[in-house]
């Protein structure tokens, strides 16, 4: 799977679109040890998938999963 | 090449069990979500249940709920689909398929024939 | 659950032909919609996901577009092997996925 990550560096990233609705949560891979700058994604399924960071589909889906994250539950 | 071969169909009576496999080849089974999607005779297509690549999630369709258990052994890089108190309404080709994580379905099994008479 | 809706249920075209169906979502499904085709006795095969990216090893005579809730899914010139049925499916809703009730390309 492009983007799939065994470890905790990416070092291929998806090119394709993500639903904002199968996503679940993020985070950033910013490690020194890390060539790449990377966005993991874990969808609803569980799996964690590689983005790069500077696209803006990538941008627009953390902000929405932040925006989600912070919306308190009834 | 990817390939999901089906058994376990056949024709059942109506509150008995069946239980469908999918052995998967060609592919990392064990990283990927799978789907178990059903046509009725001359309809169109009907969502059943899905599982994550490491079976710690499963959801289903409302109309097998609570009677339907779809699991999988990665070691042996099979999908199964437990079907209890089966129904008339349940007759069908049965598709194994797998999540592509982009919203979509695909591969697709060859399809097993599931059908509840008396 | 989102209901998607196809039309035409049945269409009759003859080779050559440029063949577009239609898909609407009951809300809202952003780009998130695939095409499928199925000939009888076999399994569905993916065509077009996210609206209108084409699949790996699918011929460029089929395209998809569209967002929110209206899609097309066109054939540009028919071929003998595209008479078959076709299904869109939406993923905006997950777990709940749905598919349409399908179209049935005929030969005329």
């Known amino acids: 799977h492009p983007g799939s990550i065994p470890t905790s560096c990416c070092f291929i990233m998806t090119s394709k679109k993500i639903p904002n609705t199968l996503l679940k949560s993020y985070k950033r891979i910013t490690n020194n040890r890390c060539t790449l700058k990377a966005i993991v994604f874990k969808t609803r399924l569980g799996k964690e998938i590689c983005a790069d960071p500077k696209k803006k589909w990538v941008q627009d889906a953390t902000k929405h999963l932040d925006q989600k994250l912070q919306t308190p539950k009834p | 090449q990817v390939q999901l071969v089906q058994s376990g169909g056949g024709v059942v009576q109506p509150g008995r069990s069946l239980r469908l496999s999918c052995a998967a080849s060609?592919?990392?089974?064990?990283?990927?979500?799978m789907h178990w999607v059903r046509q009725a005779p001359g309809k169109g297509l009907e969502w059943v249940a899905v599982i994550s690549y490491d079976g710690s999630i499963k959801h289903y369709a409302d109309s097998v709920k609570g009677r339907f258990t779809i699991s999988r052994d990665n070691s042996k890089n099979t999908l199964y689909l437990q079907m209890n108190s089966l129904r008339t309404d349940d007759t069908a080709v049965y598709y194994c398929a797998g999540d592509t994580d982009y919203g979509d379905i695909d591969p697709w099994g060859q399809g097993t024939m599931v059908t509840v008479s008396s | 659950d989102i209901q998607m809706t196809q039309s035409p249920s049945s269409v009759s075209a003859s080779v050559g032909d440029r063949v577009t169906i239609t898909c609407r979502a009951s809300?809202?499904?952003?780009?998130?919609l695939a095409w499928y085709q199925q000939k009888p006795g076999k399994a569905p095969k993916l065509l077009i996901y996210a609206a209108s990216s084409l699949q790996s090893g699918v011929p460029s005579r089929f395209s998809g577009s569209g967002s929110g809730t209206d899609f097309t899914l066109t054939i540009s010139s028919l071929q003998p092997e595209d008479f078959a049925t076709y299904y869109c499916q939406q993923a905006s809703s997950f777990p709940s996925i749905t598919f349409g009730q399908g179209t049935r390309l005929e030969i005329k």
């Open positions: 809300q809202d499904i952003s780009s998130w």
């Open positions: 060609g592919f990392t089974f064990s990283s990927y979500g």
